[in-house]
């Protein structure tokens, strides 16, 4: 049974374009993701020149940091990109939007780069083991959320080709020592643990040896017990839109969720002249919902083609997981075709055919 037409309106449906200045939008990204922050003007009007600030310091645009008046993009995010971000009016320094961004380690699945560090004949006649990729072994402490996959690697070489073994907290580590087992990829000099749990915390040591010597490296694993949360929706999405009659419109909704999210697009409607039921629940129709052939990516966009005046109104992106639901709403204003596009642009984005 899909969400019916009996649903209650959010406390403040107007606070769509992102958090109030006093509120922090909490966002979580994975390492390597693109951090996208959106801060549309309050009320849809012009907001003048803005500046993006991280932890109190103005952000300098670069190839990785793309700064726009209403949008900030940080490409290939890393731990260092975590922090408090705000968008401020340049002249008054008034905070328009406030975000708390956390970039978590998203370790590789254990299957990428396979074969890259396979044992190779170095051409050296004889020799003790040595690390072939020491720069890849810098990260001695790995903190990952529970349920992630972890891979420790110790790419090495020597002649004869050394053997690799693993210790946990100084003791021999074998598959039967953990639920779910382990994958030892000798060719890749790696140890893979899938779906880590708190009991996997500890010191992991690779021991690489041949008859000429032995080298070792110790990694510390910390498993973070994830605090479950309802889906997090990116601030400012969907954004209010102004469109010309007959044009096409797209609403976007970016959903972050640990558990598999269920996304729906709803349009608020009137029943007998009322937008809400007797108990304050809004009347909505479901425009788009998860189906057998729809991907999450497709559900993050609602496309309206050849819009009519009847398409004007309030649209909601509703996302749920096993913890709960989150929703953001936006308004579509449809203008007559003969209206000047420039005027319409004052109120938001215009999509002309």
């Amino acid at each position: 049974e899909s969400l019916g037409t009996e649903q209650r309106v959010v406390g403040r449906a107007a606070e769509v374009p992102g958090p109030e200045p006093g509120q922090q939008e909490q966002l979580v990204f994975g390492s390597g993701d693109a951090v996208e922050l959106s801060c549309p003007p309050p009320g849809g009007g012009p907001m003048g020149p803005t500046v993006w600030v991280k932890d109190g310091t103005g952000l300098v645009p670069s190839e990785r940091v793309l700064v726009g008046p209403q949008r900030l993009q940080v490409l290939n995010a890393s731990h260092e990109d975590s922090g408090a971000y705000s968008c401020r009016q340049r002249l008054t320094q008034r905070v328009l939007c406030h975000f708390s961004v956390r970039v978590t380690d998203a370790p590789s699945s254990g299957d990428d780069e396979d074969g890259e560090d396979e044992a190779e004949d170095t051409g050296v006649d004889t020799g003790a083991p040595y690390w072939t990729r020491p720069e890849r072994m810098d990260k001695k402490l790995l903190a990952v959320p529970a349920a992630n996959t972890v891979r420790f690697r110790c790419p090495a070489a020597g002649n004869p080709t050394p053997s690799i073994s693993w210790l946990k907290n100084g003791r021999e580590f074998r598959g039967e020592h953990r639920i779910g087992g382990i994958k030892l990829r000798h060719q890749q000099w790696s140890l893979v643990m899938e779906s880590v749990v708190p009991s996997d915390r500890g010191n992991y040591t690779c021991v690489v040896e041949n008859k000429f010597g032995s080298i070792r490296q110790t990694y510390t694993l910390d498993v973070l017990e994830r605090s479950p949360h309802r889906p997090i929706l990116q601030a400012g999405l969907p954004a209010n839109q102004t469109a010309v009659l007959g044009s096409d419109v797209e609403f976007h909704c970016k959903v972050y969720s640990d558990a598999q999210p269920h996304i729906q697009w709803l349009k608020h409607v009137e029943v007998n002249g009322s937008k809400v039921g007797p108990d304050g629940t809004p009347y909505v129709t479901v425009l788009k919902t998860a189906g057998a052939n729809t991907t999450d990516k497709e559900l993050e966009v609602l496309s309206l083609h050849n819009v009519t005046f009847e398409d004007a109104g309030e649209y909601t992106c509703l996302a749920g997981n096993s913890i709960g639901f989150s929703h953001h709403s936006a308004w579509l204003v449809v203008l007559p075709a003969e209206e000047e596009l420039v005027e319409a642009d004052e109120a938001g984005s215009v999509y002309a055919g």
Epitope: E1, S2, L3, G4, E6, Q7, R8, V9, V10, G11, R12, E15, Q23, Q24, S227, P228, H229, R230, A259, H262, D279, G280, T281, P282, L318, G320, N321, S322, I323, G324, F325, S326, H327
Partner: antibody, heavy 119, light 108 residues
Framework: QVQLVQSGAEVKKPGSSVKVSCKAS????????ISWVRQAPGQGLEWMGG????????NYAQKFQGRVTITADESTSTAYMELSSLRSEDTAVYYC????????????WGQGTLVTVSS | DIVLTQSPATLSLSPGERATLSCRAS???????LAWYQQKPGQAPRLLIY???SRATGVPARFSGSGSGTDFTLTISSLEPEDFATYYC?????????FGQGTKVEIK
């Protein structure tokens, strides 16, 4: 109008289990979370856990983890809460409540089920 | 978990007086996720305020909510006889959902 009707009072022995039902009518059952909240005599309200029928997965407060099981039957619009290994401190009124995801509140409540644990 | 501390534990007032109930959170709570409930003996709780300041359907105008961050307030402008009850604040900002321990408003 949404209504939540719970099963009747129960008297249980320590160590046994109790299963309380909560039948919903007048709304869209599967798309809303149903939470269970208990109240010991003269005490405050305590959230135990909840379930959203369309997701099937229940979530539990740490305190009750391993002792409570929350399930839902979409065909009968009924949610269930089973508490095992009962002890005298579990004597309380158990409420089911609908979670409104538009207002982030418990907007409708069952009438409550008194569970008395006594030897 | 977010701990909600309500004060005072008991408020003794006469009908017609103004009641001010406080709810303090151990960490910041988005106001959209803060609610107040009223409970009378032998009855289930009843939703009064959602989103920190919006009155639920059928709730009299004498009830109002305010606050943000960690400090929230429920105000009853002029107590009616039927308002003497226990009031709970509750947050859904962070999992798990938590309630305050309650404030009992009794007749002086």
């Amino acid at each position: 109008q949404v209504q939540l009707v719970q099963s009747g009072a129960e008297v249980k022995k320590p160590g046994s289990s109790v299963k309380v039902s909560c039948k919903a009518s007048g709304g869209t059952f599967s798309s809303y979370a149903i939470s269970w909240v208990r109240q010991a005599p003269g005490q405050g309200l305590e959230w135990m856990g909840g379930i959203i029928p369309i997701f099937g997965t229940a979530n539990y407060a740490q305190k009750f983890q391993g002792r409570v099981t929350i399930t839902a039957d979409e065909s009968t619009s009924t949610a269930y809460m089973e508490l095992s290994s009962l002890r005298s401190e579990d004597t309380a009124v158990y409420y089911c409540a609908r979670v409104n995801h538009w207002t982030y509140t418990f907007d409708y409540w069952g009438q409550g089920t008194l569970v008395t644990v006594s030897s | 978990d977010i701990v909600l501390t309500q004060s005072p534990a008991t408020l003794s007032l006469s009908p017609g007086e103004r009641a001010t109930l406080s709810c303090r959170a151990s960490q910041s709570v988005s106001s959209s996720y803060l609610a107040w409930y009223q409970q009378k003996p032998g009855q289930a709780p009843r939703l009064l305020i959602y989103g920190a300041s919006s009155r639920a359907t059928g709730v009299p105008a004498r009830f109002s909510g305010s606050g943000s961050g960690t400090d929230f307030t429920l105000t009853i402008s002029s107590l009616e006889p039927e308002d003497f009850a226990t009031y709970y604040c509750q947050q859904m900002s962070n999992y798990p959902d938590t309630f305050g321990q309650g404030t009992k408003v009794e007749i002086k």
